[in-house]
């Protein structure tokens, strides 16, 4: 047959040559030819390659920026990146978590409906009626007001959703 | 178009050392390939001797016990062959070749 | 080293034959990604060695198409679908996936 013009599946096109990709972790250093097979050699420390591929450099893994609330979640290795995430208190601003932020506070009259997590930032919402949060807090749920009648006291100030009601005795006059 | 061209003296003495050049064209000998080189002896067959790489680490024959020498010259994109201790059984023909690509061949006797 | 024993040694034949070359080498060509690195070259008196065939099966450019590679392993072929006057010349397999590299010791073609 004549040269090809198409390559099977982790060979790639080059000079009428169907040559081997490197495989994940390795870079190309020499192209096939019609005498030698494709020549590939591991990437160094700290660079990684994820595909098969005909990279002649590997990439650098991401380097978790402490200044910039960063840690390692998962270390790198020859075929994968680093994972980023944020310190404890802080999240990432984007999905590829190249920087991170403080968790949102919930002010007075919302409570947290769903905690932050190193990926995403705390979820709030406002009190309903029958609960309030009087703090702005990022772990605080909204409470329930006081049921004075279980404590055989009445209302005596209607609660809010930033304060909870006041209860007092009963009116002893009562006819 | 690649061309290759030996040259090179074509009478060595027994027991001295053969010495050939290669001048390549048309193809920078550091960019890829495995530079060879291939020997003949009067009406018998092909010999391979050894090569040089694109990155100018070696290969040779272990028929040729250690007497085989091939190095480079990039700058003027030319291989060397030595070859030490000649006796009368490496009179040949010698080619550079990259396989695709041959030189002409150079004769060479060893006689005194 | 991988030794190479082509077959016949010489072969007679007339202008318009099909004309089989056997190589065998004692041990497989084959490397660990699959590919087999075994090449033919025709080769006419005081001439260099020409690249026919190359990885079994590859027809080298401007070679005609009745020149044509097959075999895998150990055992391999060169067919002359239906020989031309040029075609009458000395043969050799060369294998370079094992070093040292290794020629077949020749087949020579000549006309009956």
């Known amino acids: 047959p004549e040269p090809p013009t198409a390559c099977r599946e982790k060979q790639y096109l080059i000079n009428s040559q169907c040559c081997s990709l490197c495989q994940p972790g390795q870079k190309l250093v020499s192209d096939c030819t019609e005498f030698t097979e494709t020549e590939c050699l591991p990437c160094g420390e700290s660079e990684f390659l994820d595909t098969w591929n005909r990279e002649t450099h590997c990439h650098q893994h991401k380097y978790c920026d402490p200044n910039l609330g960063l840690r390692v979640q998962q270390k790198g290795t020859s075929e994968t990146d680093t994972i980023c995430t944020c310190e404890e208190g802080w999240h990432c601003t984007s999905e590829a978590c190249e920087s991170c932020v403080l968790h949102r506070s919930c002010s007075p009259g919302f409570g947290v409906k769903q905690i932050a997590t190193g990926v995403s930032d705390t979820i709030c919402e406002p009190c309903p009626v029958g609960f309030f949060s009087n703090v702005s807090s990022a772990f605080e749920k909204c409470h329930p007001w006081t049921s004075c009648e279980t404590k055989d006291l009445v209302v005596q100030q209607a609660g809010t959703n930033k304060t909870d009601v006041v209860c007092g005795p009963q009116d002893r006059l009562r006819a | 178009e690649v061309q290759l061209q030996e040259s090179g003296p074509g009478l060595v003495k027994p027991s001295e050392t053969l010495s050939l050049t290669c001048t390549v064209s048309?193809?920078?000998?550091?960019?890829?390939?495995?530079w060879n080189w291939i020997r003949q002896p009067p009406g018998k067959g092909l010999e391979w001797m050894g090569y040089?790489?694109?990155?100018?680490?070696?290969n040779y024959n272990p028929s040729l016990k250690n007497r085989v020498t091939i190095s480079r010259d990039t700058s003027k994109n030319q291989f060397s062959l030595k070859l030490s201790s000649v006796t009368a059984a490496d009179t040949a023909v010698y080619y550079c070749?990259?396989?695709?690509?041959w030189g002409q061949g150079t004769t060479v006797t060893v006689s005194s | 080293d991988a030794q190479m024993t082509q077959s016949p040694s010489s072969l007679s034949a007339s202008v318009g034959d099909r004309v089989t070359i056997t190589c065998r080498s004692s041990?497989?060509?084959?490397?660990?990604?699959?590919?087999?690195?075994l090449n033919w070259f025709q080769q006419k008196p005081g001439k260099a060695p020409k690249l026919l065939i190359y990885?079994?099966?590859n027809r080298f450019s401007g070679v005609p198409s009745r020149f044509s590679g097959s075999g895998s392993g150990t055992d391999f072929t060169l067919t002359i679908s239906s020989l031309q006057p040029e075609d009458f010349a000395t043969y050799y397999c060369?294998?370079?996936?094992?070093?040292?590299?290794?020629f077949g010791q020749g087949t020579k073609l000549e006309i009956k």
């Open positions: 070749a990259r396989l695709d690509y």
């Open positions: 048309g193809y920078s000998i550091t960019s890829n390939y495995y």
């Open positions: 040089i790489r694109y990155d100018g680490s070696n």
């Open positions: 041990q497989s060509l084959e490397n660990t990604n699959g590919n087999t690195f």
């Open positions: 990885r079994v099966s």
């Open positions: 060369l294998q370079v996936t094992h070093v040292p590299f290794t």
